[in-house]
């Protein structure tokens, strides 16, 4: 069974908590 591995960049810009809806989806699309 395939395993999904999430690779993250430590320097990736975080998403402001208020930019998320209650289901955890980000409201905006752009990074900067």
């Amino acid at each position: 069974e395939p395993v999904v591995v999430h690779i993250t960049d430590d320097n990736e810009e975080p998403i402001a908590p208020y930019h998320f809806d209650l289901s955890g989806h980000a409201f905006g699309a752009m990074a900067c």
Epitope: A16, P17, H19, F27, G28, M30, C32
Partner: antibody, heavy 118, light 107 residues
Framework: QVQLQESGGGLVQPGGSLKLSCAAS????????MSWVRQAPGKGLEWVAN????????YYVDSVKGRFTISRDNAKNSLFLQMNSLRAEDTAVYFC???????????WGQGTTVTVSS | DIQMTQSPSSLSASVGDRVTITCRAS??????LNWYQQKPGKAPKLLIY???SLQSGVPSRFSGSGSGTDFTLTISSLQPEDFATYYC?????????FGGGTKVEIK
């Protein structure tokens, strides 16, 4: 170039209304949260309101709730701030700002001045 | 609401000095802390976002550090164009709030 330009400021009497506009250029406006930030003469910065990219979520500072309304027209790359029941303490330079995904204000307009006085 | 307290409110320094400005949040804001520079009659300019990330085009003499409640903006070698007012801002929760500002003046 990528920019924001506010307009609509002016002199208004206490209790009056004013609508500010912010025109966005050279970026995909409908991908960004947008904010209004104000600065009273000789004072610091105060966030006023912001709006989700599709306009469905809006937040306000307590001091303007029920009096100010933020809105946007993505088809016209424009942000608005309708200000009603204006008070002397609303006198300030009003800036529109584009938010980064972290909530930082990465792009600012030059500001428009609102003076509330009789 | 989250209160942001900046110190000092003003400071005098000379060209070439190392300058440190601090910002304290009334509760933990993780790394959601941003720094701005403002000159008289101009709009603020973003210097540092997410506590330590340098905004594109900002000189590397500016740096930010901290997380949780305590944060620092450092200018490693003050230049003539750096005399201005500096503000911190939290973007952890609405209402978004700013510190009261730090005016950096010429000694």
């Amino acid at each position: 170039q990528v920019q924001l330009q506010e307009s609509g400021g002016g002199l208004v009497q206490p209790g009056g209304s004013l609508k500010l506009s912010c025109a966005a250029s050279e970026f995909t406006f409908n991908n960004y949260w947008m904010s209004w930030v104000r600065q009273a003469p000789g004072k610091g910065l105060e966030w006023v309101a912001n709006i989700k990219p599709d306009g469905s979520v809006k937040y306000y500072v307590d001091s303007v709730k029920g009096r100010f309304t933020i809105s946007r027209d993505n088809a016209k790359n424009s942000l608005f701030l309708q200000m009603n029941s204006l008070r002397a303490e609303d006198t300030a330079v009003y800036f529109c700002a584009r938010e980064r995904q972290s909530g930082a204000f990465g792009l600012w307009g030059q500001g428009t001045t609102v003076t509330v006085s009789s | 609401d989250i209160q942001m307290t900046q110190s000092p409110s003003s400071l005098s320094a000379s060209v070439g000095d190392r300058v440190t400005i601090t910002c304290r949040a009334s509760q933990s804001i993780s790394s959601y802390l941003n720094w701005y520079q403002q000159k008289p009659g101009k709009a603020p300019k973003l210097l540092i976002y997410a506590a330590s990330s340098l905004q594109s085009g900002v000189p590397s003499r500016f740096s930010g550090s901290g997380s949780g409640t305590d944060f620092t903006l450092t200018i490693s070698s003050l230049q003539p164009e750096d005399f201005a007012t500096y503000y911190c801002q939290q973007s952890y929760s609405t209402p978004l709030t700013f510190g009261g500002g730090t005016k950096v003046e010429i000694k």
